[in-house]
Amino acid sequence: AVNGTSQFTCFYNSRANISCVWSQDGALQDTSCQVHAWPDRRRWNQTCELLPVSQASWACNLILGAPDSQKLTTVDIVTLRVLCREGVRWRVMAIQDFKPFENLRLMAPISLQVVHVETHRCNISWEISQASHYFERHLEFEARTLSPGHTWEEAPLLTLKQKQEWICLETLTPDTQYEFQVRVKPLQGEFTTWSPWSQPLAFRTKPAALGKDT
């Protein structure tokens, strides 16, 4: 089978996608491998081809249906297998039972836009993408703003502990270029993790009004 130098990690986007990464030290780059998904209470099954993403790491996306279709629920268990071709047959490399709603990673928020901008403030909104209706309002967000002369890693994180798809940034500097990103996470799930960061939204604060002559 596979020794401790192998890892098989998958996440469900809460709708119709399971993304998987399989890594194994010493595996050949040109080995042909697949992930098979077999739900315990569904009539469908799905396969994706693992493609190399680094020297010893492969990834693929199991597309379960239309992007906004609800293909799995909180009671589903999906058996995931990694299979690699050995000559004319496929060899099972790993088997994992996967509870999708314990392993959530949503899509990055989309449609970021500036609602209103002033000299020191900016109101920004966004939308969540392909997120299950099961969450209702049980989501949280993190946001960060890139200031001139700093890196994203230095940007302080702003936490929104509720489903709030907007933010009012304050104490900004007038006539200054900024960038803004946001990410989302459901509150449920043993291994649930943050979505990727959204695409950055660039905006500029308004210049300060010129003082009147006295």
Epitope: A1, V2, S6, A94, D97, K99, E190, F191
Partner: nanobody, 127 residues
Framework: EVQLVESGGGLVQAGGSLGLSCAAS????????MGWFRQAPGKEREFVAA????????MYAVSTEGRFTCSRDNAKNTVYLQMNSLKPKDTAIYYC????????????????????WGQGTQVTVSS
Amino acid sequence: EVQLVESGGGLVQAGGSLGLSCAASGGTFSSYAMGWFRQAPGKEREFVAATTRGGGRTMYAVSTEGRFTCSRDNAKNTVYLQMNSLKPKDTAIYYCAAMTSYYSGTYYPDSSDFDIWGQGTQVTVSS
């Protein structure tokens, strides 16, 4: 720390099914990853399955061929191993084990990763 007691072993014909249980007492069950191992006569202890603290991920030995299902009930402090389509080669003593360190459920753990072991239950599959 927890103490583990397995039950459910016995004699079964090839092609039959058997369900093992492992009851934990004396600790916080949900803070342990749980595993099943087996040891056939004259052979080394072999990994069968391991499940994470919340049961969100469970890894299975390839040798189980999808015939076994491991699950846990943290409310009942119990981990289960349902074995279907049993074969004579599944004959072994089956051990339940608990891991105090964090387990991500993304790799195959070694027996040395587990700190606490049950006394084992015999499973015999006749042809």
